[in-house]
């Protein structure tokens, strides 16, 4: 069951091309940039979205000129390598033949270096932090209504199990959702934490990846709960090695 | 108030197939997934499998792979599970359960379906 | 898949005496100190009713005399008094890992 057969759409993944071309005439979608076949009753993996969104055609915007002053962020944005699976490869290199290693999320965990640069193994980050901080509100929100709408939202839209949501944490206006997974733990067709955060991210910023679905509409008990930032803390399970120039 | 409505007792032929019907009320249909759970006369509960009623799709327990369909109807939230081939062992009460918010308990069930499988 | 074992099969009380039902699972249940263990309430020709959810929360309604314990694979439901209503089958429930699986029940009759 990998795409909707009515209209033939991906309804994890709007960043793809479907057509009945699959198996007996079945809806067979690909990942746009990849050209991957992606299985659409769950969720894709972020590294084969990323590259989907690399490749995505632009909208043409007014340029506005930023102020001397402003700090650049990039949102972790490159065209990453992706494997057979769609999981990311340990080495990412650009198109200047800069190279480093990443975690299975993608995010950079040594220092850069060139073509010669090895990184053995993909690292799995099995500890991710995700820090919300909510718009202010009549009120705090109760906790263990907060926790539970978060943990339904996480295994009914994300398809990820609560047990890998170790804990929601909060201290009015600060959210905290701890998402731990070791692999030991993730069992064939559990979703894995980082391609579920990345969804949510994705969610929050209003820059949903869901076919045709309206934006997330986060509500508990009826309240509107509204995210103003959100910072993501990645751990892995072998630590980072960067050089101590970098830290200073 | 929240509330599952199943469909009325059956009574069927061995090899034959049959189809319970549970339609929600009292809350957003797609926000919570609906389980089936059966029970044998005089026996325990037993899990079928749960259906997505966002995606629509569904996961099984491996003892009823291949017998047993679920499937959802968004218009008229009602959700439905297709039990084929049945045999006598298959008679029981069957129950459909939704999820609860936040760690997969059950926290509203259905009345029960009773199905006979009788020749 | 997790067997879930109650014990005792039959637990034959008064009311106003204290009920102690016992779930021991085959392998662990919890996740970072989330344990996967649900507790229900079946009469006859009734579905089962919710009581306690991960093996300590009480569900909404439910009286405060019904409460759950223990961690891992060791659970315990304790009625602090038994009210005449209470006579029924108690099952215990994992829902950490698919097929969820059910305990055999204990049924708690009035002596």
């Known amino acids: 069951h990998t795409a909707a057969q009515d209209n033939c759409t991906c309804p994890t993944n709007k960043m793809t091309v479907c057509s009945p071309d699959g198996p007996g005439g079945r809806c067979q979608c690909r990942a746009l940039g990849s050209g991957m076949a992606v299985d659409c009753s769950t969720l894709t993996s972020k590294c084969l979205l990323l590259k989907a969104r690399m490749s995505a055609p632009k909208n043409a915007r007014t340029l506005v000129r930023p102020s001397e002053h402003a700090l650049v962020d990039n949102d972790g944005l490159y065209d990453p390598d992706c494997d057979p699976e769609g999981r990311f490869k340990a080495r990412q290199c650009n198109q200047t033949s800069v190279c480093w290693c990443v975690n299975s999320v993608g995010v950079r965990r040594t220092d850069k270096g060139d073509l010669s640069l090895r990184c053995d193994e993909l690292v799995r980050t099995h500890h991710i932090l995700i820090d919300l901080r909510h718009r202010p509100t009549a009120g705090a929100f109760n906790h263990s209504d907060l926790d539970a709408e978060l943990r339904r939202l996480f295994r009914e839209r994300y398809r990820l199990h609560p047990k890998f949501v170790a804990a929601v944490h909060y201290e009015q206006p600060t959210i905290q959702i701890e998402l731990r997974q070791n692999t030991s733990q993730k069992a064939a067709g559990d979703v894995d934490i980082g391609d579920a955060a990345y969804y949510f991210e994705r969610d929050i910023k209003g820059e949903s990846l869901f076919q045709g679905r309206g934006g997330l509409d986060l509500r508990v008990r009826g309240e509107p709960l509204q995210v103003e930032r959100t910072l993501i803390y990645y751990l892995d399970e072998i630590p980072p090695k960067f050089s101590m120039k970098r830290l200073t | 108030q929240v509330q599952l409505v199943q469909s009325g007792a059956e009574v069927k032929k061995p090899g034959a197939s049959v189809k319970v019907s549970c339609k929600a009320s009292?809350?957003?249909?797609?926000?919570?997934?609906i389980n089936w759970v059966r029970q044998a006369p005089g026996q325990g509960l037993e899990w079928m499998g749960v259906?997505?009623?966002?995606?629509?799709?569904?996961s099984y327990n491996q003892k009823f792979k291949g017998r047993v369909t679920m499937t959802r109807d968004t218009s008229t939230s009602t959700v439905y599970m297709e039990l084929s081939s049945l045999r006598s062992e298959d008679t029981a009460v069957y129950y459909c359960?939704?999820?609860?918010?936040?760690?997969?308990?059950?926290?509203?069930w259905g009345q029960g379906t009773l199905v006979t499988v009788s020749s | 898949e997790i067997v879930l074992t109650q014990s005792p099969a039959t637990l034959s009380l008064s009311p106003g005496e204290r009920a102690t039902l016992s779930c021991r699972v085959s392998?662990?249940?919890?996740?970072?100190?989330?344990?996967?263990m649900h507790w229900y309430q079946q009469k006859p020709g009734q579905a089962p009713r919710l009581l306690i959810y991960?093996?300590?929360n009480l569900e909404s309604g439910i009286p405060a005399r019904f409460s759950g314990s223990g961690s891992g694979t060791d659970f315990t439901l304790t009625i602090s008094s038994l009210e005449p209503e209470d006579f029924a089958v108690y099952y215990c429930?994992?829902?950490?890992?698919?097929?969820?699986?059910f305990g055999g029940g204990t049924k708690v009759e009035i002596k």
């Open positions: 429930q994992q829902s950490y890992e698919d097929p969820y699986t």
């Open positions: 359960a939704r999820y609860g918010d936040g760690y997969n308990q059950f926290d509203y």
């Open positions: 991960r093996a300590s």
């Open positions: 259906i997505s009623t966002y995606y629509g799709d569904a």
């Open positions: 009292g809350y957003t249909f797609t926000d919570y997934s």
């Open positions: 392998e662990s249940v919890d996740s970072y100190g989330n344990n996967f």
